[in-house]
């Protein structure tokens, strides 16, 4: 070996100084006999080296790196070898930071393992190999006092947690904890935590399941649920507080709470949920009233709550055939009388034979809104339920009886906008108990079965806005009936559209007579229109060559006009609008030629 | 000071009941478990019941179960056991003992006889 | 249920002796085992419960080892109050259970 390099420390401070020299034994013959020494960090070369021939013939350069900012690098001592480098020793330097507090310190207790846990975070990097070790103590105190000390804990490289198991523990006496780091610029301690295992005992949750069903226990009521749990082993006789979390499967609600329940509780109706509804729990636990660290979540467990029967109310409407009055068109509409009110699977129109106690025949089973069933001749009432897999709502009577009130009068409509219609009359005396309004296409497309109905539960209302199945251009028949007690009055109607349509198109005009000044047009009227609005006027339009306009209006009964007052021998282009109030529309351009003044008039 | 002292034992005919009481001071009663553990003459330890610190769990071993009731009483610091339907093999000393949280019988009684003979 | 086997059922031996006793679940019971003194006449007493801790006030000759289903008791060194019976408890599940016992006798 030439060269030999020795340094004030191979590990610094990052940014700290260094020194090095390098010396060059002089029995390296075939080096020159002043040799340039020369200095490479990592690839690069250092300037400063400070260059001596000691006594015994030996060279010696000196180096100081006034900042070593690499955390890792290798210093070289070299010689310019003819036109190459040449290495003659080389060290390795390091440079970090001494380590820092290890901080947030914890640990748990696990009983299935029966083992004390400890993490912690180790602080920033050190950039050098850093050791770290759980240590700890037996204490009969405090932790003032320090008892028998416990085997050291290393965790495994990179990890900043180490299990202490269970036959160096303690339980139900304090140990003294803390984390001592160590490299080679320094050791640090983190604060000691002075805890019973058991404090810190961080329990299995239970497992949820769904109660068994038995035969004599009532089923669970609507929007409730029954659930059990198995206590988690370990943990059987520790006094510990649970609770339960829940939310729908659908939907982006977040987790309920619901708690503190004894562990001991083992079985829960949970209620206040919504019927018919899938649901989402979980139960976690905590060690209590002595401390301890919440369980983590259950696994989930998925249960459906009961649907509760339907509470709505069931607006009815009837009518009978008119050639087979026994023959009933039953019409109804549920109302709900709560925000949840419970789904509806179906209807069911029944009847009671008077004198057969308990005997009731089902008339019609259905999933529409209406059914149509032969009345038999002696029934005077039906009833109606809606119904689903929890039971009916309550039953709704149907009267059959004669129109024996007094009629409504004066019944008027008129459209509020292209998709609505306003239908008013006045009240008859006494009040009604309420009204029907019904409305449907009018002729030519009426239909009794696609008629709308609506209930008017005020008595005293003086009309009804609707606002359901009308389209512009549509004439509608609109009937409204009114309830009383124990009857009805007679049905009134009305005819109305709710946005009426312009004219199509204007009728064509013809010249039936022409002369020098003047020129007779006629036509022939559109015939009227379903869902077009009466024509109001016709409004006739002529232009000369020097595009002058006139124009005369004319009633809705014309059918011809004469244009006085033209210019001989002149070209006029004449067009007839045809005007409701729905709008207007032109006829096709009519262009003439009034005759020279020589000429005969043509009729 | 931390203790449990039992009574209610004594002298009982085959078929005939008797209620044991177990009075606990010097520590938070309602916290914790408490159990009945019995020992025949000559014979070893036989555990018969046990009650959670509310009373909403009981077990009871075979032999015993539905003929004895576990019950405590918090607000008396008491705990009970109601033996009913006594047989010539329930003979034997009947300790009451306090459970501590990891299953283990950390404070007992001193212990009361029971003896079920004609 | 869980049914505890105690070996042996007596032993003798002589103050300052070395002493094993070992106990057996029939299941595994993790580290619930507990071990108990019997003095005749008395309440039994807690020396050793979770398999390894020693319960206040018991002198450290007595040790606890052992999970799951197989369990020792050892007295390092024989003392004259240390001739009794001995107990092994399992508290894994509700239904706590005893083994036989163990009878230490002077020899």
């Known amino acids: 070996e030439c060269g030999h390099i020795s340094v004030s420390a191979p590990i610094v401070h990052l940014g700290d100084p260094i020194t090095a020299s390098c010396i060059i034994k002089q029995n390296c013959s075939h080096l020159d006999p002043e040799p340039q020494i020369l200095w490479r960090l990592g690839a690069e070369l250092q300037p400063g080296g400070r260059q001596q021939r000691l006594s015994d013939g030996t060279q010696e350069s000196i180096i100081t790196l006034p900042h070593l900012n690499h955390t890792q690098a290798f210093l070289s001592c070299c010689l310019n070898w003819g036109n190459s480098l040449q290495i003659l020793d080389q060290v390795e330097l390091r440079a970090g930071y001494p380590p820092a507090i290890p901080h947030n310190l914890s640990c748990l207790m696990n009983l299935t393992t029966s083992s004390l846990i400890c993490q912690w975070e180790p602080g920033p990097e050190t950039h050098l190999p850093t050791s770290f070790t759980l240590k700890s103590f037996k204490s009969r105190g405090n932790c003032q006092t320090q008892g028998d000390s416990i085997l050291d804990c290393v965790p495994k490289d990179g990890q900043s947690h180490c299990c202490i198991p269970r036959k160096h523990l303690l339980l139900y006496q304090n140990m003294g904890i803390w984390v001592q780091a160590e490299n080679a610029l320094g050791t640090s301690m983190s604060p000691q935590l002075c805890l019973d295992p058991m404090d810190v005992v961080k329990l299995e949750p239970p497992m949820l399941r769904t109660m068994d069903p038995s035969p004599e226990a009532a089923p669970p009521q609507a929007g409730c649920l029954q659930l059990c749990w198995e206590p988690w082993q370990p943990g059987l006789h520790i006094n510990q507080k649970c609770e339960l979390r829940h939310k729908p499967q659908r939907g982006e609600a977040s987790w309920a709470l619901v708690g503190p329940l004894p562990l001991e509780a083992l079985q829960y109706e949970l209620c206040g949920l919504l019927p018919a509804t899938a649901y989402t729990l979980q139960i976690r636990c905590i060690r209590w009233p002595l401390p301890g660290h919440w369980s983590d979540w259950s696994p989930s467990l998925e249960l459906r709550t009961t649907e509760r029967a339907p509470t709505v109310r069931l607006d009815t409407w009837w009518r009978q055939r008119q050639l087979d009055p026994r023959t009933v068109q039953l019409f109804w509409k549920p109302v709900p009388l709560e925000e949840d009110s419970g789904r509806i699977q179906g209807y069911v129109v029944s009847w009671r034979p008077s004198g057969q106690a308990g005997a009731i025949l089902p008339l019609c089973n259905t999933t529409e809104l209406s059914c149509t069933f032969h009345l038999p001749s002696e029934a005077q009432e039906v009833a109606l339920v809606a119904y689903n897999s929890a039971g009916t709502s309550r039953p709704t009577p149907v009267v059959f009886s004669e129109s024996r009130g007094p009629a409504l009068t004066r019944l008027h409509a008129m459209a509020r906008d292209p998709h609505s219609l306003w239908v008013g009359w006045e009240p008859p005396n006494p009040w009604p108990q309420g009204y029907v309004i019904e409305w449907g296409l009018g002729p030519p497309s009426a239909s009794n079965s696609n008629k709308t109905w609506r209930m008017e539960q005020n008595g005293r209302a003086t009309g009804f806005l609707l606002k359901e199945n009308i389209r512009p251009f549509q004439l509608y028949e609109i009937i409204v009936t009114p309830l009383y007690q124990d009857t009805m009055g007679p049905s009134q109607h009305v005819y109305a559209y709710s946005q009426e349509m312009a004219p199509s198109h204007a009728p064509e005009l013809h010249l039936k007579h022409i002369g020098k000044t003047w020129a007779q047009l006629e036509w022939v009227p559109e015939p009227p229109e379903l869902g077009k609005s009466p024509l109001t006027h016709y409004t006739i339009f002529w232009t000369n060559a020097q595009n002058q306009s006139f124009s005369a209006i004319l009633n809705a009964s014309s059918r011809g006009f004469v244009l006085h007052g033209l210019e001989p021998a002149s070209l006029y282009h004449i067009h007839l609008m045809a005007a409701s109030q729905a709008g207007a529309t032109n006829s096709t351009v009519l262009t003439l030629m009034t005759l020279t003044p020589e000429g005969s008039e043509l009729h | 000071e931390v203790q449990l002292l039992e009574s209610g034992g004594g002298l009982v005919q085959p078929g005939g009941s008797l209620r044991l009481s177990c009075a606990a001071s010097g520590f938070t009663f309602s916290l914790y478990w408490m159990g009945w553990v019995r020992q025949a003459p000559g014979k070893g330890l036989e555990w018969v019941s046990s009650i959670s610190s509310s009373g909403g769990v009981t077990p009871y071993a075979d032999s015993v179960k539905g003929r004895f009731t576990i019950s405590r009483d918090n607000s008396k610091n008491t705990l009970y056991l109601q033996m009913n339907s006594l047989r010539a093999e329930d003979t034997a000393v009947y300790y009451c003992?306090?459970?501590?949280?990891?299953?283990?019988?950390?404070?007992w009684g001193q212990g009361t006889l029971v003896t079920v003979s004609s | 249920d869980i049914q505890m086997t105690q070996s042996p059922s007596s032993l003798s031996a002589s103050v300052g002796d070395r002493v094993t006793i070992t106990c057996r679940a029939s299941?595994?019971?993790?580290?619930?085992l507990n071990w108990y003194q019997q003095k005749p006449g008395k309440a039994p007493k807690l020396l050793i419960y979770y398999a390894s801790n020693l319960q206040n006030g018991v002198p450290s000759r007595f040790s606890g080892s052992g999970s799951g289903t197989d369990f020792t008791l050892t007295i390092s060194s024989l003392q004259p109050e240390d001739f009794a019976t001995y107990y092994c408890?399992?508290?894994?599940?509700?239904?706590?259970?005893f083994g036989g016992g163990t009878k230490v006798e002077i020899k």
């Open positions: 408890q399992q508290s894994w599940a509700y239904g706590l259970s």
């Open positions: 299941q595994g019971i993790s580290s619930y």
């Open positions: 003992a306090k459970l501590g949280e990891l299953g283990m019988y950390d404070l």
